[in-house]
Amino acid sequence: IIGGSDADIKNFPWQVFFDNPWAGGALINEYWVLTAAHVVEGNREPTMYVGSTSVQTSRLAKSKMLTPEHVFIHPGWKLLEVPEGRTNFDNDIALVRLKDPVKMGPTVSPICLPGTSSDYNLMDGDLGLISGWGRTEKRDRAVRLKAARLPVAPLRKCKEVKVEKPTADAEAYVFTPNMICAGGEKGMDSCKGDSGGAFAVQDPNDKTKFYAAGLVSWGPQCGTYGLYTRVKNYVDWIMKTMQENSTPRED
């Protein structure tokens, strides 16, 4: 997180840590973690942790490790032979089904999914919270959770920023309605290592709750604007995937 501040896991109890690759995710119920497809495409058996503000290895030993049962990548995510050259992050969303249910508590609890009503349509200027252990201004990786509050911005703002290390012509980068552009204020942004974490917005119908409006996906340059997977467009896929892959007692 660039331009963020120290955060406590108690305020982001849905935050999941992936250690390989170094990334994030969001707990959405006791059996399921939501993350970005690009986080899990190269590792279908990710090790995940919840409930710890610090990801120092000695701290992780004391936090709750989650074991995956299966990874479900959105069918619209294009799997590439050379993922390093990716210019299309459309449908950057995945679900991880856990082997065992997560025990909830003050440092571990799920984030809501967006509702289907127009109340959950984001407007430019709407504020969302991002969190993670990714790169900061001073460090390659954060040891302790960082967070920042960012406004939603028009997609063109993301398009206007020059990609810092293009793997192809600027025109090759794909921008779709499945993406949210956010940031641009005081240099606050997500960065490498924050991928898959939630862009959390206050629930318009219950101010005590947050919902995952977006997932950290990609960006032209850290510290400018970032692109987030628009979770609202995938609620049907999420619900269907969870229903089809749940045990009878979960139903």
Epitope: N20, W22, S54, P83, E84, D140, V143, K192
Partner: antibody
Framework: EVQLQQSGAELVRPGASVKLSCTAS????????IHWVKQRPEQGLEWIGR????????KYAPKFQDKATMTADTSSNTACLQLNSLTSEDTAVYYC????????????WGQGTLVSVSA | DIVLTQTPDYLAVSLGQRATISCKAS??????????MNWYQQKPGQPPKLLIY???NLESGIPARFSGSGSGTDFTLNIHPVEEEDAATYYC?????????FGGGTKLEIK
């Protein structure tokens, strides 16, 4: 399994330049940071710097700022270290290393490349 | 730059005895309650091998006879009981502040 394969030994003339490579297997370099470390014969270890292959964000130790240039090519999963204006002081083994899933230490190292500068 | 001073430069220890290597930093290498001091072992012709990270955490696959302790500016690597295969040069390294720096090394010989 994570592996870092470095290019072969180099014998170069004083004043010349040399480019060393470090090719990774078992992981994408864009997910990590590549560091370079120098070790002169019978001497200790010196950190040269690091590169984030995802965006070429680099950090150099002041001593190597004008001596070394780190680059990375994510399509070939390879990082490179270029050393210029070589002198006998640059005769050393150069290692690449990565964090892996650790935070700030090196569980993974390349086997090293010996650079010998001699007229 | 943070300077790491390792003592002694050279150490000869009898088989089965304890080897203690000290590393003193010119300023604290602690950050957010964690110590960014790591220890490596290097044998001739090989790259360094991580033994201990974050002052006291044993890297996986490293025997429990290796242990690390300390915080702030003073750190110690202990090897007990020393075995033949432990003959090597040991380095401390700080990763708290750029530029990352290494100690000068301690050569351990088994008597």
């Amino acid at each position: 399994e994570v592996q870092l394969q470095q290019s072969g030994a180099e014998l170069v003339r004083p004043g010349a330049s040399v480019k060393l490579s470090c090719t990774a297997s078992g992981f994408n370099i864009k997910d990590d940071y590549i560091h370079w470390v120098k070790q002169r014969p019978e001497q200790g270890l010196e950190w040269i710097g690091r590169i984030d292959p995802a965006d070429d964000h680099t950090k150099y130790a002041p001593k190597f700022q004008d001596k070394a240039t780190m680059t990375a090519d994510t399509s070939s999963n390879t990082a490179c270290l270029q050393l210029n204006s070589l002198t006998s002081e640059d005769t050393a083994v150069y290692y690449c290393a990565i964090y892996g899933s650790g935070w700030a230490w090196f569980p993974y190292w390349g086997q090293g490349t010996l650079v010998s500068v001699s007229a | 730059d943070i300077v790491l001073t390792q003592t002694p430069d050279y150490l000869a220890v009898s088989l089965g005895q304890r080897a203690t290597i000290s590393c003193k930093a010119s300023q604290s290498v602690d950050y957010d309650g964690d110590s960014y001091m790591n220890w490596y072992q290097q044998k001739p012709g090989q790259p360094p091998k991580l033994l201990i990270y974050a002052a006291s955490n044993l890297e996986s696959g490293i025997p429990a006879r290796f242990s690390g302790s300390g915080s702030g500016t003073d750190f110690t690597l202990n090897i007990h009981p020393v075995e033949e295969e432990d003959a090597a040069t040991y380095y401390c390294q700080q990763s708290n502040e750029d530029p990352w720096t290494f100690g000068g090394g301690t050569k351990l010989e088994i008597k």
